[in-house]
Amino acid sequence: MMTGTIETTGNISAEKGGSIILQCHLSSTTAQVTQVNWEQQDQLLAICNADLGWHISPSFKDRVAPGPGLGLTLQSLTVNDTGEYFCIYHTYPDGTYTGRIFLEVLESSVAEHGARFQIP
């Protein structure tokens, strides 16, 4: 029985050109995490394997950095990075847990109503 839950950073708004950190945390289970995949719209961004470490997809190598922890840092954001991101936790013996984070990237000039976008 899968008892775990995934907590995420929550949905994020960020400005074009900035950086953001996507993070998920698996709790309420003793299952062993064997691999975490980060995906966007059916595209694989990165893999963190418990034995083999990190692999960043070649097409994202210049803008995606591993970590912190099992999270992912997206740099030099463009409007085209707007979309839903998935952290997929492969665990034993539970199976797969998925977390979802939506990122909206805004042109700097259109940040409406003085929103606070904290870019790390």
Partner: antibody
């Protein structure tokens, strides 16, 4: 003036599919997310999903995956929602709504499209 | 999914009254950057829902200042300082911090 004009009411048969349109005007269509919301029994509101007109990306409520398909036609500034394999549970009013940039809120709404599924 | 609980579910008011509607979330609506995506809507019969408040406390353009929003974390409140006839209808809170976005069950504001 921002406007979202939806297609008219529909009476459809169970098992069929149908498509609702939402024509946007008065703003840059590709600059805002477009949401779809279901209102059942004149009360409960449920988020179905959203589409990113800029790149066609989508995000769905898992409950509606396989039930709703969202698309856009940038040339006509129109968003579409196709509802598949309709049952009586799909009888509802459906709204499109524009995303308020940066706040995950919905600032302008269409007038709603009433869908009745009946044989 | 995040569950939003609104109280009360219905309110009978007289014009000129002040009312408060509560919206409680099953988990914190603060994201990792300190932003809270909680908004309030009024849905009048036969009309489209209209945005009143976004980001907890920001009034949307054209919304009268008798409407105010407050709260943090999991507890949020919409206050209407002086009820007018055009304020009658269903009030909904919406959280946009976690996927999928979820609405509260609604609070019906009607005249006594």
């Amino acid at each position: 003036e921002v406007q979202l004009q939806q297609s008219g009411p529909e009476l459809v048969k169970p098992g069929t599919s149908m498509k609702i349109s939402c024509k946007a005007s008065g703003y840059s269509f590709t600059g805002h997310l477009m949401n779809w919301v279901k209102q059942s029994h004149g009360k409960n509101l449920e988020w179905i999903g959203l589409i990113i007109p800029y790149n066609g990306g989508t995000s769905y409520n898992q409950k509606f995956k396989g039930k709703a398909t969202l698309t856009v036609d940038k040339s006509s500034s129109t968003a579409y929602m196709e509802l598949l394999s309709l049952t009586s549970d799909d009888s509802a009013v459906y709204f499109c709504s524009r995303g308020l940039r940066g706040f995950y809120a919905m600032d302008y709404w269409g007038q709603g499209t009433s869908v009745t599924v009946s044989s | 999914d995040v569950v939003l609980t609104q109280t009360p579910l219905s309110l009978s008011v007289s014009f000129g009254d002040q009312v408060s509607i509560s919206c409680r979330s099953s988990q914190s609506l603060v994201n990792s950057y300190g932003n809270t995506f909680l908004s309030w809507y009024l849905h009048k019969p036969g009309q489209s829902p209209q945005l009143l408040i976004f980001g907890i406390s920001n009034r949307f353009s054209g919304v009268p200042d008798r409407f105010s929003g407050s709260g943090s974390g999991t507890d949020f409140t919409l206050k209407i300082s002086t009820i007018k006839p055009e304020d009658l209808g269903m009030y909904y809170c919406l959280q946009g911090t976690h996927q999928p976005p979820t609405f509260g069950p609604g609070t019906k504001l009607e005249v006594k």
